[in-house]
């Protein structure tokens, strides 16, 4: 949950690619005004996930989730929250 | 804002070699089945995507990272 809060559109696109769902990917890419060549590039990546099957998608999703919830990222998220709180306090 | 570790993972997935990418994944999930899967996907992407495709994927990522939705 926390990782999706940091950059929701990234995770939208990532999971649409890894999921192999072309319609979902198109919807996600529309949100960032992706050009046709950019869409083509993302679909080539998506093809690799589709070709390698469900287990491949699950395993790579696991990698992304693990990285996103690692101390490298969570430490960053906590640090950002602390900075935000400091700014808000100073703002008052 | 996207986490730098995630950004590095995605950058290596697109622009690195399979060896580099798998080494990066291993820092977070050192299971042999996960690492072999990462290598398979990376090699697949390298074979499918041209230099131009990768440029386009990188420009899309820039749009994502700078989007108000990120």
């Amino acid at each position: 949950v926390k990782m999706a809060e940091t950059c929701p559109i990234f995770y939208d696109v990532f999971f649409a690619v890894a999921n192999g769902n072309e319609l979902l990917l198109d919807l996600s890419l529309t949100k960032v005004n992706a050009t046709e060549p950019e869409r083509t590039a993302m679909k080539k990546i998506q093809d690799c996930y589709v070709e390698n099957g469900l287990i491949s998608r699950v395993l790579d999703g696991l990698v992304m989730t693990t990285i996103s919830s690692s101390k490298d990222c969570m430490g960053e998220a906590v640090q950002n929250t602390v900075e935000d709180l400091k700014l808000n306090t100073l703002g008052r | 804002e996207i986490c730098p570790a995630v950004k590095r993972d995605v950058d290596l997935f697109l622009t690195g070699t399979p060896d580099e990418y798998v080494e990066q994944v291993a820092q977070y999930k050192a299971l042999p089945v996960v690492l072999e899967n990462a290598r398979i996907l990376k090699n697949c992407v390298d074979a499918k995507m041209t230099e131009e495709d990768k440029e386009n994927a990188l420009s899309l990522l820039d749009k994502i990272y700078t989007s108000p939705l990120c």
């Epitope: - | 399979p18 090699n43 041209t50 230099e51």
Partner: antibody, heavy 120, light 106 residues
Framework: QVQLVESGGGLVKPGGSLRLSCAAS????????MNWIRQAPGKGLEWISY????????YYADSVKGRFTISRDNAKNSLFLQMNSLRGEDTAVYYC?????????????WGQGTTVTVSS | EIVMTQSPDFQSVAPKEKVTITCRAS??????LHWYQQKPDQSPKLLIK???QSFSGVPSRFSGSGSGTDFTLTINSLEAEDAATYYC????????FGQGTKVEIK
Amino acid sequence: QVQLVESGGGLVKPGGSLRLSCAASGFTFSDYYMNWIRQAPGKGLEWISYISSSGSTTYYADSVKGRFTISRDNAKNSLFLQMNSLRGEDTAVYYCARDGRYNTVAGDYWGQGTTVTVSS
Amino acid sequence: EIVMTQSPDFQSVAPKEKVTITCRASQNIGGSLHWYQQKPDQSPKLLIKYASQSFSGVPSRFSGSGSGTDFTLTINSLEAEDAATYYCLQSYTLRTFGQGTKVEIK
């Protein structure tokens, strides 16, 4: 056009050291991964090492690991191979080769090679 | 370490004939296989990348196929200038060359 020119080869005694260089031109050197590949007299090609575009990551074949060091100077468009503890079996023509940008191919352009002879 | 085995080691073929060189990997390497041509006293030149993609400027008589562990380089109508040694290279994990196949014109 892409040009790779190796230099630094020569005759060296077993146990000795040698530093090979590869001067690159005709492309943005700092964008590309680079390799060293060798070919012993009358034999096939053997990949020995590659280095990432920034120089931060290096990989080696087992036959040279711990003895050879690949490095680069992007400001000078140069690739290097430091060879220590040289053995007779290191006698070969040494080629530098460029990888396609973003790992889109391994070894798309090669230099003409420089000859290293290890003999007492 | 992935071992690449080419066959045959040597082939003598008449002009205009078809040449087939195979390369077998000791494990699945997907499509991460490249083919090179080396003429005597010259440096190698890339012919085919990722199993079947022709490199720019390479004559159309050269083609590649295969995936997984078995790969083929085909020269459709051999010309005199094709006399050379041909090598496969895997880039699936690190890099390994096959031992080479020498093609001679009859």
